[in-house]
């Protein structure tokens, strides 16, 4: 499987929300022994390897905020840990999976990856991410609900391991 | 926070058999396999099997198969392994370990304190 | 059965020093993963996926290795990591841990 992000780009306003969104696309196993790990978490743009380095969204780390669920179920984050913090994942049956962040800050500016991994029986198979950068402005120049850039196909098709 | 309280010591005739409980707290129960694990002195961990309490699919080491049966009650977030026809071999402390997914990777994430089973005449 | 072969099985070292103890696998791994057991106590989860720290390990310890040879380091002994270290498999039923190495402090 692949992922791809439809959005590489989100500029949004201090206080609205934002839902960032990863796909899983191509084939996905729904044997009973697969599951999906899946979860988001801040980096930088590396040199080497863009979510290479792993930082934490509003000091919550990727374990934190991670979801893991077989291949053919829905899942959301509902531990109060993340709700506490304007923080929640979802992943539906469509392999959409996305994280929403409420009541946005300038702090909350800057690059998101998502990572997926297939677990095949306890061993991780295949892992994958996707980058997107949310932009958050205030004062007269920043819109007034967010403004989304889709991703170049070349882009949204490409897969890192991670 | 994930905990795992297995039940106390046992001292058992050979020939005997002997039901070990490991009750979860702390985490969906019925999502991650729970694991049981042998250790004798001198000898190191040696992994008996594994139970998903939600389906109560099981896996077995070939070594254990007829030793060792693994039940789960998810009413009560309760593992249980029974071991039968205990000898002196069977003397060891017993763990109940939970899967944990981390950063992608499953593994042993949290263990109970142990259960020591000691085999005498 | 993937057989962990642990080298050495006991391993003596003043505070301050280097130590590197090593697991073998029989059949080359994606991935290892070790566990510390202080006596007395249950293991616990200390290294995963051959590289990446435990939340609440030390900064000192480390990991490294691929295919069949793998390698737990700690830059700088301390008194507290005496300690027996685990390597595991869980690529194939059974699922194995390697005999363990053995650390003591002088």
């Known amino acids: 499987f692949k992922v791809a992000t439809p959005y590489s780009l989100y500029v949004c306003p201090e206080g609205q929300n934002v839902t960032l969104t990863c796909r899983l696309l191509g084939p996905v196993d729904k044997g009973h022994d697969v599951t999906f790990y899946k979860t988001w978490y801040r980096s930088s743009r590396g040199e080497v390897q863009t979510c290479s380095e792993r930082r934490p969204i509003r000091n919550l780390t990727f374990q934190d905020l991670h979801l893991h669920h077989g291949g053919h179920q829905a899942a959301n984050t509902s531990h109060d840990l993340a709700q506490r913090h304007g923080l929640e994942s979802a992943s539906d049956h469509h392999g959409n999976f996305s994280i929403t962040m409420r009541n946005l800050t300038l702090l909350d500016s800057g690059l998101y990856c998502c990572l997926v991994v297939e677990i095949r029986h306890h061993h991780s198979e295949h892992r994958v991410h996707g980058a997107m950068e949310l932009q958050v402005q205030t004062g007269k120049d920043a819109p007034s609900n967010c403004v989304v850039y889709p991703s170049s196909s070349q882009d949204s098709e490409n897969i890192t391991a991670a | 926070q994930v905990q795992l309280q297995q039940s106390g010591a046992e001292l058992m005739k050979p020939g005997a058999s002997v039901k070990i409980s490991c009750k979860a707290t702390?985490?969906?129960?019925?999502?991650?396999?729970i694991e049981w694990v042998k250790q004798r002195p001198g000898h190191g961990l040696e992994w008996i099997g594994e139970?998903?309490?939600?389906?109560?699919?099981?896996n077995y080491n070939e070594k254990f198969k007829g030793k060792a049966t693994f039940t789960a009650d998810t009413s009560s977030n309760t593992a249980y392994m029974q071991l039968s026809s205990l000898t002196s071999e069977d003397s060891a402390v017993y763990y109940c370990?939970?899967?944990?997914?981390?950063?992608?990777?499953?593994?042993?994430?949290?263990w109970g304190q142990g259960t020591l089973v000691t085999v005498s005449a | 059965q993937i057989v962990l072969s642990q080298s050495p099985a006991i391993l003596s070292a003043s505070p301050g020093e280097k130590v590197t103890m090593t697991c073998r696998a029989s059949?080359?791994?994606?991935?290892m993963h070790w566990y510390q057991q202080r006596p007395g106590s249950s293991p616990k989860p200390w290294i995963y996926?051959?590289?990446n720290l435990a939340s609440g390990v030390p900064a000192r310890f480390s990991g490294s290795g691929s295919g069949t040879s793998y390698s737990l380091t700690i830059s700088r002994v301390e008194a507290e990591d005496a300690a027996t270290y685990y390597c595991?498999?869980?690529?194939?039923?059974?699922?194995?841990f390697g005999g363990g190495t053995k650390l003591e402090i002088k």
């Open positions: 370990a939970s899967e944990e997914v981390y950063d992608g990777y499953p593994w042993f994430g949290y």
């Open positions: 702390g985490y969906t129960f019925s999502r991650y396999w």
């Open positions: 139970i998903l309490p939600g389906s109560g699919s099981t």
């Open positions: 059949s080359s791994l994606s991935y």
């Open positions: 595991q498999q869980w690529s194939s039923n059974p699922y194995t």
């Open positions: 996926a051959t590289s």
